[in-house]
C-alpha cells in the first residue's frame, strides 16, 4: 500500500510542478519594473522570456514579441533552452509514469517492468526540475548583474540639468513559481525512485532443502515467492496454488474501465 | 456618446468641505481609470487626482494630499472628491476626465466651479 | 516631480502660416519597455474644457485635422500647426503621463498676428 501511495504522491507532486514549470514559462512576469525609486510610475514594464509589456494606469496593456533570434542574449536563449528541456522531460516523464502506476494495470505488465518506468520517470522528473530551477537561477544571476550594472549607471553622467531615469528590473512572479515548481518536480521525481525500490523484485532463489517430517514428506521449492523489499503486504505475490484467495491487487484481474491499453 | 457631467460645486468658506460628483454615460465606467484635474481662474491646468479602474490605487498632487480623497462607484458609474480643509487657492473649475491609451484624457466634463472664500 | 516648461508662453501667427510650440520636460519621458514618450498635447479654447490631440507625444486622436503633427522625444517636444487656421486659436498644453504627479506646462496661448 505505501509504495502505491508513494508512486503515486510522486506523480500528482511531478505534475503539479511541471504545470507551474509550463505556466513559468508562459508567464510574462520573469522580471518587473523595480519602483524603488520611484513608486508612483504611471507606467510599469515587466518582461518575459517571450515577450516584454507595458501597463499604463489607464489600465492599456501593450506586449511585444522577440521577434528576433539572433539578437536576443545569449543567457536568455540558454534560459529558453533549460526550460523547454525542463517541460519536454516532464512531459515524457508524466507519460511514462502514467503506464508505471501500480493503480492502473496494462495487459501482464511484469512488475519489474513497472519499476523500471518507475525509476526512468522518476530520473526524467528529477532532470526537468533541476532544468527548471537551473533555467530560474541564470535569469536571476542575470537581473541582478543588470540590476548593480543600471544602478551604478543611474549616479553617473548626471552633469546636465536633464534627469534621464533608467529602468531597472527586479525579481517577477514567474521567478518564484520557477522556482518552487522545480523544486516539486524534483521532490515528486526522488518520490517516483523511492517507490521504484519498493516496486523491484529482488530475484533471490534459495536451494531447494527437503525436510523429513515424521510420517510424511513435503518439499519446498524455490521460487514460490518472490522476495520483495516492498512496504508491507502491497507487492504482488505468484500464487503456488490457485485458491479462492487472491491479493489486494489482483482482485480485478479483466479488464475494465480503469484499464489503460 | 461618452458624456462626463459634474456636479457638488459652489461656494464655500475656508475650511470647509464639499464631495464633487461626475456622473459617467456612454462607456463602460469600470473599464476605465479615471481623474479630476482643476483649473484656477485665468490660470493653466493642475492635476489633482487619479483613482485607478479597480479603485485600489489612488494618487493625488501634494497640494491636495491628505485633505481631498477621490473614489469611485462603478455600480452607480459615479466618480468622486471629497474635498475637506479646503483653502482659498483650491478655488478652480474642477473638470472630471478619462484617462486612455498613453495615460492621456480623452474625455472631459464641462466642469464644476468650487470657490473657497469667507 | 516632473516640471514641464513651454516656450512661448504666447504667439501670434498670420493665417495659413505656421506655428511651432515647444515643450521641455525635466526628465526623460522615453520609456524604455515600449519606446514611447508618455507626453501629451490638449486645446482649450476660451469657455471649454480641454481637448487631447496627442498622446504618445506623436499619435494624434481621432478627429484631430492633420495640420496638427506632434514630434520630439526624451525630454525636448513639439506641437506644430502647419498651416494655421481661425479656429485654432486657443491655449495649449503639453503634458507628462508618464509618472505621478502628471504635471503640465503653463500653457502657449496662440493668437492671429
Known amino acids: 500500500m505505501a509504495v502505491t501511495a508513494c508512486q503515486g504522491l510522486g506523480f500528482v507532486v511531478s505534475l503539479i510542478g511541471i504545470a507551474g514549470i509550463i505556466a513559468a514559462t508562459c508567464m510574462d512576469q520573469w522580471s518587473t519594473q523595480d519602483l524603488y525609486n520611484n513608486p508612483v510610475t504611471a507606467v510599469f514594464n515587466y518582461q518575459g522570456l517571450w515577450r516584454s509589456c507595458v501597463r499604463e494606469s489607464s489600465g492599456f496593456t501593450e506586449c511585444r514579441g522577440y521577434f528576433t533570434l539572433l539578437g536576443l542574449p545569449a543567457m536568455l536563449q540558454a534560459v529558453r533552452a533549460l526550460m523547454i528541456v525542463g517541460i519536454v522531460l516532464g512531459a515524457i516523464g508524466l507519460l511514462v509514469s502514467i503506464f508505471a502506476l501500480k493503480c492502473i494495470r496494462i495487459g501482464s505488465m511484469e512488475d519489474s517492468a513497472k519499476a523500471n518506468m518507475t525509476l526512468t520517470s522518476g530520473i526524467m522528473f528529477i532532470v526537468s526540475g533541476l532544468c527548471a530551477i537551473a533555467g530560474v537561477s541564470v535569469f536571476a544571476n542575470m537581473l541582478v548583474t543588470n540590476f548593480w550594472m543600471s544602478t551604478a549607471n543611474m549616479y553617473t553622467g548626471m552633469g546636465g540639468m536633464v534627469q534621464t531615469v533608467q529602468t531597472r528590473y527586479t525579481f517577477g512572479a514567474a521567478l518564484f513559481v520557477g522556482w518552487v515548481a522545480g523544486g516539486l518536480t524534483l521532490i515528486g521525481g526522488v518520490m517516483m525512485c523511492i517507490a521504484c525500490r519498493g516496486l523491484a523484485p529482488e530475484e533471490t532463489n534459495y536451494k531447494a532443502v527437503s525436510y523429513h517430517a515424521s510420517g510424511h514428506s513435503v518439499a519446498y521449492k524455490p521460487g514460490g515467492f518472490k522476495a520483495s523489499t516492498g512496504f508491507g503486504s502491497n507487492t504482488k505475490n505468484k500464487k503456488i496454488y490457485d485458491g479462492g484467495a487472491r491479493t489486494e491487487d489482483e482482485v480485478q484481474s479483466y479488464p475494465s474501465k480503469h484499464d489503460y491499453v | 456618446e461618452v458624456q462626463l457631467l459634474e456636479s457638488g460645486g459652489g461656494l464655500v468658506q475656508p475650511g470647509g468641505s464639499l464631495r464633487l460628483s461626475c456622473a459617467a454615460s456612454?462607456?463602460?465606467?469600470?473599464?476605465?481609470?479615471m481623474s479630476w484635474v482643476r483649473q484656477a481662474p485665468g490660470k493653466g491646468l493642475e492635476w489633482v487626482a487619479t483613482?485607478?479602474?479597480?479603485?485600489?490605487?489612488?494618487y493625488y498632487a501634494d497640494s491636495v494630499k491628505g485633505r481631498f480623497t477621490i473614489s469611485r462607484d462603478n455600480s452607480k458609474n459615479t466618480l468622486y472628491l471629497q474635498m475637506n480643509s479646503l483653502r482659498a487657492e483650491d478655488t478652480a473649475v474642477y473638470y472630471c476626465?478619462?484617462?486612455?491609451?498613453?495615460?492621456?484624457?480623452?474625455?472631459w466634463g464641462q466642469g464644476t466651479l468650487v470657490t473657497v472664500s469667507s | 516631480d516632473i516640471v514641464m516648461t513651454q516656450s512661448p508662453d504666447s504667439l501670434a501667427v498670420s493665417l495659413g502660416e505656421r506655428a511651432t510650440i515647444n515643450c521641455k520636460s525635466s526628465?526623460?519621458?522615453?520609456?524604455?519597455?515600449?519606446?514611447?514618450?508618455?507626453l501629451s498635447w490638449y486645446q482649450q479654447k476660451p469657455g471649454q474644457p480641454p481637448k487631447l490631440l496627442f498622446y504618445?507625444?506623436?499619435t494624434r486622436e481621432s478627429g484631430v485635422p492633420d495640420r496638427f503633427s506632434g514630434s520630439g522625444s526624451g525630454t525636448d517636444f513639439t506641437l506644430t500647426i502647419s498651416s494655421l487656421q481661425a479656429e485654432d486659436v486657443a491655449v495649449y498644453y503639453c503634458?507628462?503621463?508618464?509618472?505621478?504627479?502628471?504635471?503640465f506646462g503653463q500653457g502657449t496661448k496662440l493668437e492671429i498676428k
Open positions: 504618445w507625444a506623436s
Open positions: 456612454g462607456f463602460t465606467f469600470s473599464s476605465y481609470t
Open positions: 483613482i485607478i479602474i479597480g479603485g485600489s490605487y489612488t
Open positions: 503634458q507628462n503621463d508618464y509618472s505621478y504627479p502628471f504635471t
Open positions: 526628465q526623460s519621458l522615453l520609456n524604455s519597455g515600449n519606446q514611447k514618450n508618455y
Open positions: 476626465t478619462r484617462l486612455v491609451k498613453g495615460n492621456a484624457m480623452d474625455y
